[in-house]
Every structure is written in structure tokens, then in C-alpha cells.
């Protein structure tokens, strides 16, 4: 889980070791702050859970691409 010690900087110290179904992901944000020990992606799920993931993993990149496309596609 993400950890905000000194708000507003949120850092990830551990990554999920499992793929999360892309259909359960609502949004993401990148963590690139130099105050954090590692770069990370924090996914927010449709039930508002936040999960730290490793941006180097393919499923994480695929999920971000999927969410980007979803955001670009206007709802009919």
C-alpha cells in the first residue's frame, strides 16, 4: 500500500507481486519524487483501493496504456 509519511509526498516501498485485472482499475498516478526510494505507479481500483506497482513490469505498462485509451475515448 502507498504510504504518505510527510504529506503531500506519497511513496511506495513494496510492489504488488500479482497482476491485477485491468478491468478492475479505475485510474493511476506515477510516483517520481526524488524523496521516494523508487519510482512507482499507484493504481486506484473501481472500489477505491490503492495499489503500488512496478512501472518496469509489462502488465503495469499495459494497464496504464489501457487506462490512457479509456480516458481518451469519449463515452457514448
Amino acid at each position: 500500500q502507498p504510504d504518505a509519511i510527510n504529506a503531500p509526498v506519497t511513496c511506495c516501498y513494496n510492489f504488488t507481486n500479482r497482476k491485477i485485472s485491468v478491468q478492475r482499475l479505475a485510474s493511476y498516478r506515477r510516483i517520481t519524487s526524488s524523496k521516494c526510494p523508487k519510482e512507482a505507479v499507484i493504481f486506484k481500483t473501481i472500489v477505491a483501493k490503492e495499489i503500488c506497482a512496478d512501472p518496469k513490469q509489462k502488465w503495469v505498462q499495459d494497464s496504464m496504456d489501457h487506462l490512457d485509451k479509456q480516458t481518451q475515448t469519449p463515452k457514448t
Epitope: S21, I51, K75
Partner: antibody, heavy 119, light 113 residues
Framework: QVQLVQSGAEVKKPGASVKVSCKVS????????MHWVRQAPGKGLEWMGG????????IYAQKFQGRVTMTEDTSTDTAYMELSSLRSEDTAVYYC????????????WGQGTLVTVSS | DIVMTQSPDSLAVSLGERATINCKSS????????????LVWYLQKPGQPPKLLIY???TRESGVPDRFSGSGSGTDFTLTISSLQAEDVAVYYC?????????FGQGTKVEIK
């Protein structure tokens, strides 16, 4: 193509435990979410629990808490469901089921394992 | 927990006639941001595991005949078999996958009249 192959039928006495296995092929277990669903004779489907990557842990239906343990052996891509303190009402077919990365629903099911609890 | 309630419990329909099964969830399973309903339909024949028919409430799984259709949104859903065939005799289940614990409807048995 993903395949789930479960262990064979079991007959157990009340109070005993049973351990059912589910071997995954076509994927590695760590890429999937494994769940267990049971069905008593002539009854409906009942979700027992499974690995929830959103929580990073296995979650269990309240009804089975304390009596069921779901484990995985990632070296053999085999999942296990152990149910203890068996009673006659636990007589059922037990299914393993998984969902893939691009879905959230159960795409694949094992063939089922009949567990009979009888004295 | 989200409670799923199906109606009717059983249904007898003549061959070639329409069969309609309803499923109601106690809470909405629609995620408004992507406008998707996290609801699936399965059919189950005796001695077999459930088979996926429809996901996202209305999308047919590949290989499923087009006589099967799903509709509805939010809390109220319908599975329709437009022209019942002998091989459609089975028990049909709805299931929500919006939030854990995942829950099933109690099932609807479809028979030939």
C-alpha cells in the same frame, strides 16, 4: 489455453479435513487469481474464497472463515483448498476457478471434485 | 455483501419460444466512469462446471450463439434466450464481480414445456 485439473473424489468422516488440489497449465499461478466455489447436490453456486490481488491476500467468505485454508505452490502451479471440521452439509462438488488479466470474471473452471462427508 | 436474486426459480418454455430470466442486485454493479456493469451470466449442465455465457451484462462470450442476449444496468438485469433449443436446458446463474465477496444468484432452471 488455460486448463485447470482437480484432484479426484474424496469420502471423509464428519470432523475430518479434506484437501483438494487444482493444477494450472497454460499460465503460471502468479499471473492469475485463483478462487474456489462449491455446489451442494441440487443447490446453487457458493463462492468460498480466493486470492484478491487488490488486498494482496487470500480472502474468505464469512461462512467459511476459520475452517478453510487456501494455499498455493507456485513451483508446481498448484492451488489447494483445505476444509476442516467437516460435516454432512459440506458434501458438495468443489470447483477451482480463475480469472485472467483482461477480465475480472471467472473465465476458466476446473472439472470439479466431489467431496462426500458420511459416517 | 451484494445479494443477487434471480427470478423465476424455474421456467418451462416450449421449443422455439423465448425464455427470460431476471437478476436483481442489492447494490449497483455499474461503475459509472467506464459505464460497465460488472455482471456475468453462466449456464451449467448436470455434471459439468459452469460455462461463461455473457460478461459486462451484455457482451456474449465468443462461441456463444446469438440467441443468447443480456441486458440491463445498475441493479436490474435480464438474460434472454430468443428461441429455446433442446441443448439450452440447464441452470442459469448471474454473478457480480464488482466487489468482493463475489456473489451468485440462486440459479434459474430452464426446462422444455
Amino acid at each position: 489455453q488455460v486448463q485447470l485439473v482437480q484432484s479426484g473424489a474424496e469420502v471423509k468422516k464428519p470432523g475430518a479435513s479434506v484437501k483438494v488440489s487444482c493444477k494450472v497449465s497454460g499460465y503460471t499461478l502468479t499471473e492469475l487469481s485463483m478462487h474456489w466455489v462449491r455446489q451442494a447436490p441440487g443447490k446453487g453456486l457458493e463462492w468460498m474464497g480466493g486470492f484478491d490481488p487488490e488486498d494482496g491476500e487470500t480472502i474468505y467468505a464469512q461462512k467459511f472463515q476459520g475452517r478453510v485454508t487456501m494455499t498455493e505452490d507456485t513451483s508446481t502451479d498448484t492451488a489447494y483448498m483445505e476444509l476442516s471440521s467437516l460435516r454432512s452439509e459440506d458434501t458438495a462438488v468443489y470447483y477451482c476457478a480463475i480469472h485472467e488479466f483482461w477480465s475480472g470474471y471467472f473465465d476458466y473452471w476446473g472439472q470439479g471434485t466431489l467431496v462426500t462427508v458420511s459416517s | 455483501d451484494i445479494v443477487m436474486t434471480q427470478s423465476p426459480d424455474s421456467l418451462a418454455v416450449s421449443l422455439g419460444e423465448r425464455a427470460t430470466i431476471n437478476c436483481k442486485s442489492s447494490l449497483s454493479v455499474l461503475y459509472s466512469s467506464n459505464n460497465k456493469n460488472y455482471l456475468v451470466w453462466y449456464l451449467q449442465k448436470p455434471g459439468q462446471p459452469p460455462k461463461l455465457l455473457i460478461y459486462w451484462a451484455s457482451t456474449r462470450e465468443s462461441g456463444v450463439p446469438d440467441r443468447f442476449s443480456g441486458s440491463g444496468s445498475g441493479t436490474d438485469f435480464t438474460l434472454t434466450i430468443s428461441s429455446l433449443q433442446a441443448e439450452d436446458v440447464a441452470v442459469y446463474y448471474c454473478q457480480q464481480y464488482y466487489s468482493s465477496p463475489w456473489t451468485f444468484g440462486q440459479g434459474t432452471k430452464v426446462e422444455i414445456k
